[in-house]
Interface confidence: medium
């Protein structure tokens, strides 16, 4: 912490300007009024203070606002935001999307830091839900943002926000997250026609149930193998050979290359070998002809 010393004669800051970069730390502490700093925060970002000098400026703001900074100051923190701890940020009440954008811009190009994660958490909790504009902003800065949320947090995403989601935003989502997002996407895109609907829903299909995959197989969608491989195994297993053939269209040939990987491997084990043979791909491992298949799960459900 900087010692309290009197400001030398003639050095009292009348405004926040570039001449202050030549002030020693103790001079900044003694000669810059915290209230002046707060009202002229927008200037700080355009002045290349060293990070040791920024420590002094932060200290002054902390003394002025022990309960947390007002949004008028937060919006103009600029590089000073990088000095904030998650504990500092938990004291803030950030409601403006412009403030959020301004602070995310400072951290642009870096990994999501604990400070940014705390900021986003405060912002979203303050809004009550993850609306479309917020999601638009967050995924623009952090494509993986959506997949960093828990299924419980994702449940607060309104279907209307799904329009903001790009395929790359879902790259790191696991099946539990897609289970939550898929029904929202289905609802959001329900009024689109067949081919347009498939383009939009494709990224979310890792959360689709069997009945929806069966319905898609009737629509000539030509699903690519990469999408098929991300489907839930339990949703793929009940599909017939004919349904998978219709679902994949010309991409069905790709099954051969994936026959040792889930969900293709598990699906093959559930199909009759003679049905698999109709594909002409040389897929092996199906149920031999003449064997009876008992669906025990169905029997348990009936008893």
């Amino acid at each position: 912490e900087v010692e309290k010393t009197a400001c030398p004669s003639g050095k009292k800051a009348r405004e926040i300007d570039e001449s202050l970069i030549f002030y020693k730390k103790w001079e900044l502490e003694a000669c810059v009024d915290a209230a002046l700093l707060a009202t002229q925060m927008d200037r700080v970002n355009a002045i290349p203070f060293t990070y040791e000098q920024l420590d002094v400026l932060k200290h002054k703001l902390d003394e002025l606002y022990p309960q947390g900074y007002p949004e008028s100051v937060i919006q103009h923190l600029g590089y000073l935001f990088l000095k904030m701890s998650p504990e500092d940020i938990r004291k803030w009440n950030v409601t403006s999307l412009e403030t959020l954008k301004a602070l995310l811009e400072v951290n642009k190009g870096h990994e999501m830091s604990p400070q940014v994660a705390t900021l986003i958490d405060r912002f979203v909790k303050g809004r009550g839900q993850l609306d479309k504009d917020t999601l638009d902003t967050l995924t623009a800065f952090y494509p993986g943002y959506l997949c960093s949320l828990s299924p419980e947090e994702l449940s607060s995403v309104p279907p209307s926000s799904i329009w903001a989601v790009r395929p790359q935003d879902l790259d790191t989502c696991d099946p539990r997250q897609l289970d939550v997002l898929y029904p929202k996407a289905r609802l959001a895109f329900q009024n689109m026609n067949g081919s347009e609907y498939f383009v939009k829903i494709q990224s979310f299909l890792g959360g689709a149930p069997t009945e929806d995959l069966k319905a898609l197989s009737q629509q000539n969608v030509s699903m690519d193998l990469a999408t098929f491989m991300k489907l839930r195994t339990d949703a793929v297993l009940p599909l017939t050979v004919a349904e998978v053939q219709k679902l994949l269209g010309p991409h069905v040939e790709g099954l051969k290359a994936e026959e040792r990987h889930r969900p293709v491997r598990d699906w093959i084990l559930r199909q009759r070998q003679d049905d698999l043979d109709t594909l002409g791909l040389g897929l092996q491992g199906g149920i031999p002809n003449g064997y009876l298949v008992l669906d025990l799960s169905m029997q348990e459900a009936l008893s």
């Epitope: 970069i21 355009a46 290349p48 040791e52």
Partner: antibody
Framework: QVQLQQPGTELVKPGASVKLSCKAS????????MHWVKQRPGQGLEWIGH????????NYNEKFKSKATLTVDKSSSTAYMQLSSLTSEDSAVYYC??????????????WGTGTTVTVSS | DIVMTQSQKFMSTTVGDRVSIICKAS??????VAWCQQKPGQSPKLLIY???NRYTGVPDRFTGSGSGTDFTLTISNMQSEDLADYFC????????TFAGGTKLEIK
């Protein structure tokens, strides 16, 4: 990748001026301050000053205030330093360098290729 | 202005040596010090920032230490490609200042 390209040499007469360029590529020019540093043979480096490409703001080492003038051209992602009233003392290699800052660090991460200025009649 | 001093202008070394280069600041600069390497005819290259953080891609034989006024750059296993000038720089306050540098030479 990030590069700062400078002309190799400038031969100038005493009393004349020279304008050195530093062309940036591989990053958003307006997002980083550009600094200029002087290096004379057998001597240490001296910080001349810096410019803020986003708004043209500048700061100078007191020693170079009447010697150097820093400008930027955003459209060509180029920083310039004009040196005036040249004497043999100004013969040196001049570097531009990009200044990066984060939460608890700052440094010159990329240096220009350097321009050798020779003042001779 | 803060004066940075590297008292040893030259140091003789051999491959495999452990080399320590000392840098002193005229006043407390915290950890706001960087170390650079410069080979003849080339631009400086960043090795260490914030006194002890190795920059991306820098071999781990280079380490930085110190805070306040005394700083050290150590090369734990000297290699022939490490023959160069090394200088420290402070960025605690303006004007930014550099030490004169230490040139490593082969014995």
């Amino acid at each position: 990748q990030v590069q700062l390209q400078q002309p190799g040499t400038e031969l100038v007469k005493p009393g004349a001026s020279v304008k050195l360029s530093c062309k940036a590529s591989g990053y958003t020019f307006t997002s980083y301050w550009m600094h200029w540093v002087k290096q004379r043979p057998g001597q240490g480096l001296e910080w001349i000053g810096h410019s803020n490409p986003s708004n043209g703001g500048t700061n100078y080492n007191e020693k170079f205030k009447s010697k150097a003038t820093l400008t930027v051209d955003k459209s060509s992602s180029t920083a310039y330093m004009q040196l005036s009233s040249l004497t043999s003392e100004d013969s040196a290699v001049y570097y531009c360098a990009r200044w990066v800052r984060g939460s608890n660090y700052e440094y010159f991460d990329v240096w220009g290729t350097g321009t050798t200025v020779t003042v001779s009649s | 202005d803060i004066v940075m001093t590297q008292s040893q202008k030259f140091m003789s070394t051999t491959v495999g040596d452990r080399v320590s280069i000392i840098c002193k600041a005229s006043q407390n600069v915290g950890s706001a010090v960087a170390w650079c390497q410069q080979k003849p005819g080339q631009s400086p290259k960043l090795l260490i920032y914030s006194a002890s953080n190795r920059y991306t891609g820098v071999p781990d034989r280079f380490t930085g230490s110190g805070s306040g006024t005394d700083f050290t750059l150590t090369i734990s296993n000297m290699q022939s490609e490490d023959l160069a000038d090394y200088f420290c720089q402070q960025y605690s306050s303006y004007p930014l200042t550099f030490a004169g540098g230490t040139k490593l030479e082969i014995k």
